[in-house]
Interface confidence: low
């Protein structure tokens, strides 16, 4: 069971990143699915290595004082959402914006029907060029 | 099937990074090989988790305006090269240069004879001290 | 065999990061253990994917000139410690400090009784908020 999906620009104002099965994507079988273009949902309980990479372009003067944060989050059936992993990068002083890349990854137990998704502080800053931003998992 | 190789400084002007089976490297068997010191080639079709880490030292004034970009690329037999993953970091204002580290990783299907390699915008900026820059894969 | 442990603030002056089985941690069985809150120790020989993520907050003026370095280190029975992976990030000019995240990961052969741990140049700069700093491994 494995998946690798590719970032997609979205006009939605939500902080949850959008993904697509496009380009050189992976979807090994129907035991993992991309739901609503926003979350990877697994059908089998087990340990999974889950990862995300986010490249963004921001400028200190044009952004809020708070850093750019990417969060890998879990929603299990009947449970509250929870943060699994986070990374934070202070905005660049480069103009018009400075690019930076974040990589998250870790081993977590998922229940049947559990979904994982990626949140960012400002989706408009995310880079969607080939290979820059992606999201995936593999079952151990 | 798994491999982990270690960066090697090169006098070549190519943007493809060079690697060696040295230090605490891994080469599990002959189903994965390091070819010409530049690419990991697999003999078996399947899903692989492929990763690379690149540490570099650059300065904004001494570098081009474009950011430092590391790309994980795929060359399959009879196909064009393609980019699997990229990460970008704007150059530091630190002098003489500021160090930054990039990590790339994802799950991809590889065909028999497929090769993966790592490209960077400026190989002269890459750090080759122990553990700073490495490249590997594992078959799921 | 898999583990994922969560960072813990420590009053110790050591550069070795401290970890805990808390929050959404993973400890698959007793073939991998967290020893003294500082190292993951495995009982079985084999290839392991080992990873660490460290988020830190630092300022160029308040820090030493040297960059912030995170190192993934190995201690095998009867052998000297050795560095497996390192990442380096120059300190931010943001005030009071600028956050940055580092991710390390690679495939390594571990012997029975081998331990892996994470070293940083300044543990007081490490961020311990939910999901920011973690450490783990999985046996291939």
């Amino acid at each position: 069971i494995a998946a690798h999906v590719i970032s997609e620009a979205s006009s939605k104002t939500t902080s949850v990143l959008q993904w697509a099965e496009k380009g050189y994507y992976t979807m090994s079988n129907n035991l993992v699915t991309l739901e609503n273009g926003k979350q990877l949902t697994v059908k089998r309980q087990g340990l999974y290595y889950i990862y995300a990479q986010v490249t963004f372009c921001s400028n200190r003067e044009a952004s809020s004082q708070a850093p750019f944060i990417a969060s890998l989050c879990l929603k299990s059936p009947g449970r509250f959402e929870r943060i699994l992993l986070r990374a934070a990068n202070t905005h660049s002083s480069a103009k018009p914006c400075g690019q930076q890349s974040i990589h998250l990854g870790g081993v977590f137990e998922l229940q049947p029907g559990a979904s994982v998704f990626v949140n960012v502080t400002d989706p408009s800053q995310v880079s969607h060029g080939t290979g820059f931003t992606s999201f995936g998992l593999l079952k151990l | 099937i798994a491999a982990h190789v270690i960066s090697e400084a090169s006098s070549k002007t190519t943007s493809v990074l060079q690697w060696a089976e040295k230090g605490y490297y891994t080469m599990s068997n002959n189903l994965v090989t390091l070819e010409n010191g530049k690419q990991l080639t697999v003999k078996r079709q399947g899903l692989y988790y492929i990763y690379a880490q690149v540490t570099f030292c650059s300065n904004r004034e001494a570098s081009s305006q474009a950011p430092f970009i590391a790309s994980l690329c795929l060359k399959s037999p009879g196909r064009f090269e393609r980019i699997l993953l990229r990460a970008a970091n704007t150059h530091s204002s630190a002098k003489p240069c500021g160090q930054q580290s990039i990590h790339l990783g994802g799950v991809f299907e590889l065909q028999p004879g497929a090769s993966v390699f790592v490209n960077v915008t400026d190989p002269s900026q890459v750090s080759h001290g122990t553990g700073f820059t490495s490249f590997g894969l594992l078959k799921l | 065999i898999a583990a994922h442990v969560i960072s813990e603030a420590s009053s110790k002056t050591t550069s070795v990061l401290q970890w805990a089985e808390k929050g959404y941690y993973t400890m698959s069985n007793n073939l991998v253990t967290l020893e003294n809150g500082k190292q993951l120790t495995v009982k079985r020989q084999g290839l392991y994917y080992i990873y660490a993520q460290v988020t830190f907050c630092s300022n160029r003026e308040a820090s030493s000139q040297a960059p912030f370095i995170a190192s993934l280190c190995l201690k095998s029975p009867g052998r000297f410690e050795r560095i497996l992976l390192r990442a380096a990030n120059t300190h931010s000019s943001a005030k009071p400090c600028g956050q940055q995240s580092i991710h390390l990961g690679g495939v390594f052969e571990l012997q029975p009784g081998a331990s892996v741990f994470v070293n940083v140049t300044d543990p007081s700069q490490v961020s311990h908020g939910t999901g920011f700093t973690s450490f783990g491994l999985l046996k291939l």
Epitope: C57, Q99, G129, T130 | V16, A66, P67, F80, E81, I83 | -
Partner: nanobody, 128 residues
Framework: EVQLVESGGGLVQPGGSLRLSCAAS????????IGWFRQAPGKEREGVSC???????SYTDSVKGRFTISRDNAKNTVYLQMNSLKPEDTAVYYC??????????????????????WGQGTLVTVSS
């Protein structure tokens, strides 16, 4: 605004030659990979050739030895020199690029979904 404009197409006899041009505006072409694609009537669009920011090139097997891609950074233009043309080369030829705040390094790709910006195309007809 990023724009690509192809020119140089036309009717040519088998064995003849044409030189296609792809003129870029709105960005500095030398920083990016450029791909040439073609779409024959009733067929899917396919990659023909590409050139990276550093000048490395790739070609699909059916055109190797006959087609040559090149770039003139001063003119912000990429060329496709097509020699020994065959009837099966008949198609609309497009150039495309992916200028996403940074360049692609030495690699280039002719998978069409990798490219964000496309020209309007130029028709090449090889017939006696």
């Amino acid at each position: 605004e990023v724009q690509l404009v192809e020119s140089g197409g036309g009717l040519v006899q088998p064995g003849g030659s044409l030189r296609l041009s792809c003129a870029a505006s709105g960005f500095t072409l030398e920083y990016y990979a450029i791909g040439w694609f073609r779409q024959a009537p009733g067929k899917e669009r396919e990659g023909v050739s590409c050139i990276s920011s550093e000048g490395s090139t790739s070609y699909t097997d059916s055109v190797k030895g006959r087609f040559t891609i090149s770039r003139d950074n001063a003119k912000n233009t990429v060329y496709l020199q097509m020699n020994s043309l065959k009837p099966e080369d008949t198609a609309v030829y497009y150039c495309a690029t992916d200028p996403d705040r940074g360049f692609l390094g030495s690699s280039c790709d002719t998978q069409s979904h990798q490219y964000d910006y496309w020209g309007q195309g130029t028709l090449v007809t090889v017939s006696s």
